[in-house]
């Protein structure tokens, strides 16, 4: 099938979230990359949309990202927007309910997002060639 | 490819007002902020005012609060300056900016040139 | 506001030079500052954000380091195409503020 405007639109997102970073984007999350070999795309997607969740769920309202004037709040308020907006287009190319998070392994949301980016990259290659 | 392009510059007597465009392509216009930045002639730049364009907040430099307005048209994608009581001192290139998604401001338009003159 | 001040005002180098850059902040900013580059008749460009992070495509002979209040600009070895003016900029708080510029001539 050819690359779904979903895709697209994730694609563009990590484009713009991997533009600059911010002191929150150096905070870790679960590295689900670390060990995906036995992990179907699908999987892989909601497990990187549960990951994100877990992110913005805990640190949405958490003070060393809002920061202390309303110039870095801003910031904040729009990491969390654009992570809100990448969870729920992954979850929609996913089409699971849910999906365990268990690996030990960490990165930086900086570093999730970077490779996120190159997976989803390469899938939008082979549905557009 | 993110484009910005001013419009709306001239000459306009003391006392008197412009409103100045600047029309974005190229990316989605609310995921980012909007700002306008001048430079007077032979002269460093000074920041105005900032909006955020999914909400419409603006915020502004002390100096411009009152005489300057800042706007956006979603639907269009174009930012707006209104700029009244003009004086001999607001003559500069008017540039509209877009601000990084975190940080600065990472897109700039050519710039609209702006004389207040009698 | 918080006010930028730049030194040197000009810098009078050689293509291959080291260049540095200073700004001094009248308060902490923490690491929210900026440098852009301007060339006549031309808008300015982000170089660096949030004190020393290279904005996309821009070459790694630039880099920024600093915290607080005080700021540098280090290009390592000046291109022909460096010559230029270099601000910094504050986006801590609003206003937003600019340095007055540091001009990079050729010697």
């Known amino acids: 099938h050819k690359c779904d405007i979903t895709l697209q639109e994730i694609i563009k997102t990590l484009n713009s979230l991997t533009e600059q970073k911010t002191l929150c984007t150096e905070l870790t999350v679960t590295d689900i990359f670390a060990a995906s070999k036995n992990t179907t795309e699908k999987e892989t997607f909601c497990r990187a949309a549960t990951v994100l969740r877990q992110f913005y769920s805990h640190h949405e309202k958490d003070t060393r990202c809002l920061g202390a004037t309303a110039q870095q709040f801003h910031r904040h308020k729009q990491l969390i927007r654009f992570l809100k907006r990448l969870d729920r287009n992954l979850w929609g190319l996913a089409g699971l309910n849910s999906c365990p998070v268990k690996e030990a392994n960490q990165s930086t949301l900086e570093n999730f997002l970077e490779r996120l980016k190159t997976i989803m990259r390469e899938k939008y290659s082979k549905c557009s060639s | 490819e993110v484009q910005l392009v001013e419009s709306g510059g001239g000459l306009v007597q003391p006392g008197g007002s412009l409103r100045l465009s600047c029309a974005a392509s190229g990316y989605t216009f609310t995921d980012y902020s909007m700002h306008w930045v001048r430079q007077a002639p032979g002269k460093g730049l000074e920041w105005v005012v900032w909006?955020?364009?999914?909400?419409?907040?603006?915020t502004y430099a002390d100096d411009f609060k009152g005489r300057f307005t800042i706007s956006r048209d979603n639907s269009k994608n174009t930012l707006y300056l209104q700029m009244n009581s003009l004086r001999a001192e607001d003559t500069a290139v008017y540039y509209c900016?877009?601000?990084?998604?975190?940080?600065?401001?990472?897109?700039w338009g050519q710039g609209t040139l702006v004389t207040v003159s009698s | 506001e918080i006010v930028l001040t730049q030194s040197p005002a000009t810098l009078s180098l050689s293509p291959g030079e080291r260049a540095t850059l200073s700004c001094k902040a009248s308060q902490s900013v923490i690491n929210d500052a900026a440098w852009y580059q301007q060339k006549p008749g031309q808008a300015p460009r982000l170089l660096i954000y949030?004190?020393?992070h290279r904005y996309t495509g821009i070459p790694a002979r630039f880099s920024g380091s600093g915290s607080g209040t005080d700021f540098t600009l280090t290009i390592s070895s000046l291109e022909p195409e460096d010559f230029a003016v270099y601000y910094c900029?504050?986006?801590?708080?609003?206003?937003?503020?600019f340095g007055q510029g540091t001009k990079v001539e050729i010697k």
């Open positions: 909006i955020n364009t999914e909400t419409g907040e603006p």
């Open positions: 900016a877009r601000g990084g998604i975190f940080y600065g401001m990472d897109y």
């Open positions: 949030y004190t020393s």
């Open positions: 900029q504050q986006d801590y708080t609003s206003p937003w503020t």
